[in-house]
């Protein structure tokens, strides 16, 4: 069974996983550019179940698309640096799920765009840190 | 103890910028990620931003995007926040707080000719 | 944005009174909501995390209920030291908006 240090200690790094992804939609949201436009044209692979931890592979494994994608939105206007925010998310990915993890992830048949990619990872989040909390 | 110590008030003119700082003790500095509210006078609680203190990215407001900027010196384990071009009615007390249940004292900047 | 609205903006209570406090998200919010108590020249206090779990320190005649887009703060015995003003906070999603607060005053 977990301990209660583990447990904080996961939860915490879902709370910095969240925020981060939260914070590249909210750059998103707030991006007045006809690159917004653009970033909307790429497709993302979505989970066909995400429910735990070892799920987190379908979002390492597409977080090299996703640097891609923001590497689209720079400008002043846009705070978010990709590749240290990538490293950082890819960071915490690897900590929560486990780097030995054998997990094949599963994707859904259906693509999504880079907002809705970004929902249901920080969906995702939010519902483990309420099972935590 | 845990604790966030924020910079003295401040008086500015209009047009001008200001750069407020907020320092953390008794916790581990890049743990928790730093967000900036502000209070006008006789007024409710205002979201600026937020930033990691250690990646050193930020993510702003709509309303402030352009006129803000958030930035940290993990070697002072200080985040500092900037506001430019500086109107009266961003007269307000800017507070820092971490993980929310943490908060500085607040800083009263104001904003007159 | 998430539109988050309070009710009463004010009211008159006296000693050993029950308040509740009312918060509505303008869209579900699940249970992202946190309560904090603010009282002139300080900063605000986190009182209720989580919709209805309380922070350290803080006394047990203070509870939160609710999800999706209603929320109730309530107090069941109102001590002089918690005349203030409160209000209610979402982080479902940036940006994070607060309530318009509520004044508590001795009646």
């Known amino acids: 069974a977990p301990t209660s240090s583990s447990t904080k200690k996961t939860q915490l790094q879902l709370e910095h996983l969240l925020l981060d992804l939260q914070m590249i939609l909210n750059g998103i949201n707030n991006y007045k550019n006809p690159k917004l436009t653009r970033m909307l044209t790429f497709k993302f692979y979505m989970p066909k179940k995400a429910t735990e931890l070892k799920h987190l592979q379908c979002l390492e494994e597409e977080l090299k698309p996703l640097e891609e994608v923001l590497n689209l939105a720079q400008s002043k206007n846009f705070h978010l640096r990709p590749r240290d925010l990538i490293s950082n998310i890819n960071v915490i990915v690897l900590e929560l799920k486990g780097s030995e993890t054998t997990f094949m992830c599963e994707y859904a048949d259906e693509t999504a765009t880079i907002v809705e990619f970004l929902n249901r990872w920080i969906t995702f989040c939010q519902s483990i840190i309420s099972t935590l909390t | 103890q845990v604790q966030l110590v924020q910079s003295g008030a401040e008086v500015k003119k209009p047009g001008a910028s200001v750069k407020v700082s907020c320092k953390a003790s008794?916790?581990?500095?890049?743990?928790?990620?730093m967000h900036w509210v502000r209070q006008a006078p006789g007024q409710g609680l205002e979201w600026m931003g937020i930033i990691n203190p250690r990646a050193g990215y930020t993510s702003y407001a709509l309303k402030f995007q352009g006129r803000v900027t958030m930035t940290r010196d993990t070697s002072t384990s200080t985040v500092y926040m900037e506001l430019s071009s500086l109107r009266s009615e961003d007269t307000a007390v800017y507070y820092c707080t971490s993980g929310w249940d943490v908060w500085g004292q607040g800083t009263l900047v104001t904003v007159s000719s | 944005d998430i539109q988050m609205t309070q009710s009463p903006s004010s009211l008159s209570a006296s000693v050993g009174d029950r308040v509740t406090i009312t918060c509505r998200a303008s869209?579900?919010?699940?249970?992202?909501l946190a309560w904090y108590q603010q009282k002139p020249g300080k900063a605000p206090k986190l009182l209720i995390y989580?919709?209805?779990s309380l922070d350290s320190g803080v006394p047990s005649r203070f509870s939160g209920s609710g999800s999706g887009t209603d929320f109730t703060l309530t107090i069941s015995s109102l001590q002089p030291e918690d005349f203030a003003t409160y209000y209610c906070q979402q982080s479902y999603s940036f940006p994070v908006t607060f309530g318009q607060g509520t004044k508590v005053e001795i009646k």
């Open positions: 008794g916790y581990t500095f890049t743990t928790y990620y």
């Open positions: 869209q579900s919010i699940s249970t992202w």
């Open positions: 989580a919709a209805s």
